[in-house]
């Protein structure tokens, strides 16, 4: 079951999925001036059996101006521009992506990929949050959101990470705690 909405945004934080549940789709989007090849896939799909998960289909982009360039090679570093809020500079790795059954790793980039990745998540997907540079977590508790099915509708749990700047933090008494770590799990909500 696909999640109806994107994971929630929270102030001064970014999120990232560490691994993608089977059923997740990633749109094959191309950067400006490029388009999907005519017979190319619309999306990549995380599929698998009990022992192994991987991405089905390949995304391929070709120049809008030319007809038949269908190369698919790993881009040079300068082509790997910023990707969406889900791509964070310093990755938090609560689990080894490869060790999570029923999940796919982050797909490798494809040539002339769009700067922002658009995922379609499924129920049970978890994303992790981290404060952006210049902000720090008020608390080291769980920093995640989970897509859950409740009353026949999907919803993401509210992340419990609070990121404050120095000015805000100074309003509050008590010591600062270190950066959020995703050990706790606020996802165990009873569904109807």
């Amino acid at each position: 079951e696909l999640c109806d909405d994107d994971p929630p945004e929270i102030p001064h934080a970014t999120f990232k999925a560490m691994a993608y549940k089977e059923g997740t789709m990633l749109n094959c989007e191309c950067k400006r001036g490029f388009r999907r090849i005519k017979s190319g896939s619309l999306y990549m799909l995380c599929t698998g059996n009990s022992s192994h998960s991987s991405w089905d289909n390949q995304c391929q982009c070709t120049s809008s101006a030319t007809r038949n360039t269908t190369k698919q090679v790993t881009p040079q570093p300068e082509e790997q521009k910023e990707r969406k809020t889900t791509e964070m500079q310093s990755p938090m790795q609560p689990v080894d992506q490869a060790s999570l059954p029923g999940h796919c790793r982050e797909p490798p980039p494809w040539e002339n990929e769009a700067t922002e990745r658009i995922y379609h998540f499924v129920v049970g997907q978890m994303v992790y949050y981290q404060c952006v540079q210049g902000y720090r977590a008020l608390h080291r508790g769980p920093a995640e959101s989970v897509c859950k099915m409740t009353h026949g509708k999907t919803r993401w749990t509210q992340p419990q990470l609070i990121c404050t700047g120095e000015m805000e933090t100074s309003q509050f008494p008590g010591e600062e705690k270190p950066q959020a770590s995703p050990e706790g799990r606020p996802e165990s909500e009873t569904s109807c």
């Epitope: 102030p11 508790g141 509210q158 705690k177």
Partner: antibody, heavy 116, light 107 residues
């Protein structure tokens, strides 16, 4: 089903102490911030602050710092709001909610009346 | 603290009307705004978060818009159940603050 159930209405005299409670169920209570909100008679909503039940870390609104105390007992999924010396101006409805940003679940409220 | 100002404070309308409530922030808050509905003697209920995201189970006649300092809650086709008081709340800055409320009453 996620629920927050608050203790019953209280009538107190100025100078008395009071502790009201908020019991959560249907979710991992220890791992969600609990927000306290005050609503004085006929007035709007005021954010008092938050507590994280897992380790009882608290954050108070500057307006309520030193006036009230938040606490929690995660073993019984309960958060508390207390006063050591009530004033007539503490008369209000007090809500606990699940946070920390927007409040998606609310308790039914506890009416506190302070009158001599 | 960021101040939140709602207008009007009272709004008279009829069933079937389209009504709009405005909330202004004293400084930019991005899209970090929630709207709540409160009926007499009841706890508030979350309607919208992130300025325009409808909370699960809330009728689609409710919608939110705006960013920065000016936000609007719109109720299209007002229903008898919608006569209540509405509050905005910012969560860009952690102290959170609420608007003063807008009472939607029967004309």
């Amino acid at each position: 089903e996620v629920q927050l159930v608050q203790s019953g209405a209280e009538v107190k005299k100025p100078g008395e102490s009071l502790k009201i409670s908020c019991k959560g169920s249907g979710y991992s209570f220890a791992n969600y911030w609990i927000v306290w909100v005050r609503q004085m008679p006929g007035k709007g909503l005021e954010w008092m602050g938050i507590i994280y039940p897992d380790d009882s870390e608290t954050r108070y609104s500057p307006s309520f710092q030193g006036q009230v105390t938040f606490s929690a007992d995660k073993s019984i999924s309960t958060a508390y709001l207390q006063w050591s010396s009530l004033k007539a101006s503490d008369t209000a409805m007090y809500y606990c909610t699940r946070g920390p940003y927007y409040s998606d679940y609310w308790g039914q409220g506890t009416l506190v009346t302070v009158s001599s | 603290d960021i101040q939140m100002t709602q207008s009007p404070s009272t709004l008279s309308a009829s069933v079937g009307d389209r009504v709009s409530i405005t909330c202004r922030a004293s400084q930019s808050i991005g899209s970090w705004l929630a709207w709540y509905q409160q009926k007499p003697g009841k706890a508030p209920k979350l309607l919208i978060f992130e300025a325009s995201n409808l909370e699960s189970g809330v009728p689609s006649r409710f919608s939110g818009s705006g960013s920065g300092t000016e936000f609007t809650l719109t109720i299209s086709n007002l229903q008898p159940d919608d006569f209540a008081t509405y509050y905005c709340q910012q969560y860009n800055s952690y102290s959170l603050t609420f608007g003063g409320g807008t009472k939607v009453e029967i004309k």
